[in-house]
């Protein structure tokens, strides 16, 4: 759930590494409320997610590796 | 090595609710999810949830939304599912399973089920 | 939600033929697929992850294959004990559907 690229809450599903191709960053300041995790789907959909959760840790954790390969 | 162990079968009234254990033993229990999936007499199997003992955090099926709660208590290393407003088609054999994100998400160890039944 | 659908939902066989079971998804799961046996009376067993890995201490009679949205799981020479009903899953992303399940049959 987003408003003008701003993650407004999180989804409530876990997704599978398989189906992210990438992800950003979003802090919280003057325009966006939430920190969040940005994924970004094989279906060009952007998933906002909790970055405290250990799913989404985990994710990111193994996208970063991919990038540092890379 | 790697045991779930699950509480008793249960025989409840329609409208009671139920609370169903799984005792995990054998490995890290932080490290892994604990997912909750069902199946009626003579039926498939249905995903009704998991949780993550790591962070308490919890994702259900919508069809059990409302009705259902996962809970975890690291210091025994024990998940539970309860299961309100309880009809007679919540009558089924309940399994706890690992979630292993190491082996593409599969549930790699599984509970021995505990059967619930529900009638008046 | 992802709807997966198996097929057949029964299949009478004998011991040394070789078995398909196929499962498709409503939607791309990209390889997000695993495969499951349950014995009557028993909790599942996984055996296949990631729609082609052999679980630990699966034998090599069975593979799996499949990409996309169509999935299977073969047998290549059925044994007595693999006589059991076998299910996909979906865990592309929750809730994690499961198929309605293959009941394999003693011809």
């Known amino acids: 759930a987003s408003n003008f690229d701003c993650c407004l809450r999180y989804t409530d599903r876990i997704l599978h590494p398989k189906f992210i191709v990438g992800f950003t960053q979003q802090l919280a300041n003057e325009t966006c409320d939430i920190n969040a995790v940005v994924f970004h789907t094989k279906k060009g959909l952007s998933v906002c997610a909790n970055p405290k959760q250990t799913w989404v840790k985990l994710i990111v954790r193994r996208l970063s590796k991919k990038i540092n390969k890379m | 090595q790697v045991q779930l162990v699950q509480s008793g079968a249960e025989v409840k009234k329609p409208g009671a609710s139920v609370k169903v254990s799984c005792k995990a033993s054998g490995y890290t229990f932080t490290n892994y999810w604990m997912h909750w999936v069902r199946q009626a007499p003579g039926q498939g199997l249905e995903w009704m949830g998991v949780?993550?003992?790591?962070?308490?955090?919890?994702t259900y099926a919508q069809k059990f939304q409302g009705r259902v709660t996962m809970t975890v208590d690291t210091s025994t290393s024990t998940v539970y599912m309860e299961l309100s407003s309880l009809r007679s088609e919540d009558t089924a054999v309940y399994y706890c399973a690992r979630g292993n994100y190491g082996v593409d998400y599969a549930m790699d160890y599984w509970g021995q089920g505990t059967l619930v039944t529900v009638s008046s | 939600d992802i709807q997966m659908t198996q097929s057949p939902s029964s299949l009478s066989a004998s011991v040394g033929d070789r078995v398909t079971i196929t499962c498709r998804a409503s939607?791309?799961?990209?390889?997000?697929l695993n495969w499951y046996q349950q014995k009557p009376g028993k909790a599942p067993k996984l055996l296949i992850y990631g729609a082609t890995n052999l679980a630990d201490g699966v034998p090599s009679r069975f593979s799996g294959s499949g990409s996309g949205r169509q999935y299977s799981l073969t047998i290549s020479s059925l044994q007595p004990e693999d006589f059991a009903t076998y299910y996909c899953q979906n865990v592309l992303i929750t809730p994690y559907t499961f198929g309605g399940g293959t009941k394999l049959e003693i011809k």
């Open positions: 949780i993550d003992p790591s962070d308490s955090y919890t």
């Open positions: 939607e791309n799961i990209y390889g997000a």
